[in-house]
């Protein structure tokens, strides 16, 4: 009874819930549950019976494999799904699939919290803002990743001439998607002066974005 599989999928996708092993031979009945007591569908050697539930009309059972197809999953479909098989012998066997449905991450906005000349060095504090999501952050300077210990929503670093980068990219990701945001600086320590700067993010799996100084909320200190 202890088979538990974890699945993570992106919201809006079509999902197949199935087990990695073969079903018991000539089983008598098969049931899929949402949580522990909500039946979705049951097969009993003659037909599939789809019950009243939030899944009605967007699920399909394959009695041969036991696979359950769910279309257009949403975050509300997060649950442990249970497949119960009643064998010809009278015994039951259960498999559990814990489904996690995640929304694609939104495109982050980079806020310049502080930018300050300090002799030949440049103190920089950037924050990567996305609305209430649990995500991973990766910062890049000219497409080279910063060390792991700097990987959170705020990048705070002192730039010296030898490690100065022109563009800073924040990549936010969860297990189903990732998006990037980028800001560029002009040496030694100012925002890029062009009114509009085209930043290519193709190498980081993002998209091209037209960014202007006016788009950036920042405190600019000299």
């Amino acid at each position: 009874q202890g088979h538990l599989v974890h699945m993570t999928v992106v919201s809006g996708s079509n999902v197949t819930l199935n087990i990695s092993e073969s079903l018991p031979e000539n089983y008598k009945q098969l049931t899929w549950f949402y949580t522990f007591d909500q039946k979705i569908v049951e097969w009993d050697s003659r037909k599939s019976k789809y019950f009243e539930s939030k899944f009605k009309g967007r699920v399909r059972l394959d009695p041969q494999s036991g696979a359950l197809y769910i279309s257009k999953v949403q975050k509300e479909d997060n649950s442990t799904y249970i497949m119960r098989v009643l064998k010809k012998t009278g015994n039951e066997q259960e498999w559990k699939i814990k489904l996690q449905v995640l929304d694609p991450v939104p495109k982050p906005v980079i806020k310049i919290e502080k930018i300050e000349d300090m002799d030949d060095n440049c103190y920089l504090k950037l924050s990567c803002v996305i609305p209430g999501e649990s995500v991973n952050y990766t910062w890049y300077g000219d497409k080279r990743p910063f060390p792991k210990e700097l990987q959170n929503s705020v990048l705070e670093t002192t730039l010296m001439p030898h490690n100065y980068s022109r563009c800073y990219t924040c990549q936010v990701s969860n297990s189903v998607s990732s998006k990037n945001g980028t800001v560029c600086l002009s040496p030694p320590c100012t925002l890029a002066r062009s009114e509009q700067k085209l930043i290519s993010e193709e190498d980081l799996g993002g998209e091209q974005k037209l960014i202007s100084e006016e788009d950036l909320h920042h405190h600019h200190h000299h």
């Epitope: 049931t31 049951e42 003659r46 019950f51 009278g90 015994n91």
Partner: antibody
Framework: QVQLVQSGAEVKKPGAAVKVSCKAS????????ISWVRQAPGQGLEWMGW????????NNAQKFQGRVTMTTDTSSSTAYMELRSLGSDDTAVYYC??????????????WGQGTLVTVSS | DIQMTQSPSSVSASVGDRVTITCRAS??????LAWSQQKPGKAPKALIY???SLQSGVPSRFSGSGSGTDFTLTISSLQPEDFATYYC?????????FGQGTKLEIK
Amino acid sequence: QVQLVQSGAEVKKPGAAVKVSCKASGYTFTAYGISWVRQAPGQGLEWMGWISAYDGDTNNAQKFQGRVTMTTDTSSSTAYMELRSLGSDDTAVYYCARDRYSSSSGYFDYWGQGTLVTVSS
Amino acid sequence: DIQMTQSPSSVSASVGDRVTITCRASQDISSWLAWSQQKPGKAPKALIYAASSLQSGVPSRFSGSGSGTDFTLTISSLQPEDFATYYCQQANSFPYTFGQGTKLEIK
């Protein structure tokens, strides 16, 4: 939580019919079958028959064939058992019980509280 | 019809005792067997299904075993609330049939 609530006690004359109801709550009614079981005073349990709440399929014990009718009303999540041509030996407590499956498996996981039917002239 | 025979028909025991009730089917029923408990004036309560699977919410002191024709229900350490009548029932084929019951009494 799952509940099966049965109708109240009945007193019937020999030859009459009785209809016992079993109202289900706390689960999707059509996803399970209902069996009917009776128990005469001081005696053991006797299975009478089964009905699928999904499609109305039934299977009755031979002993009650032609005398018992089992039905469901999905709009009210209620199962009914009607027993006709009552005799004194039909005096018993009648129970409904939920089957774990929509097609009968014979495994009952929840029982109603019982309905006493007394047949007396 | 499949006949189900329980033994003993009654048994006296004390709190804390280990009790075993047996059930024999008149033909092979594989694991298609259930056990239920009934207290006076109350509806039966499901304990075990598929010969050895514990019904949800039933204490683990109850266990079932066997297959084919011979089955047992064991209560590992009797509690005061366990004194009742126990029934086995075959689910192998229609008509489903019950054993005659085993009454468990306080010694």
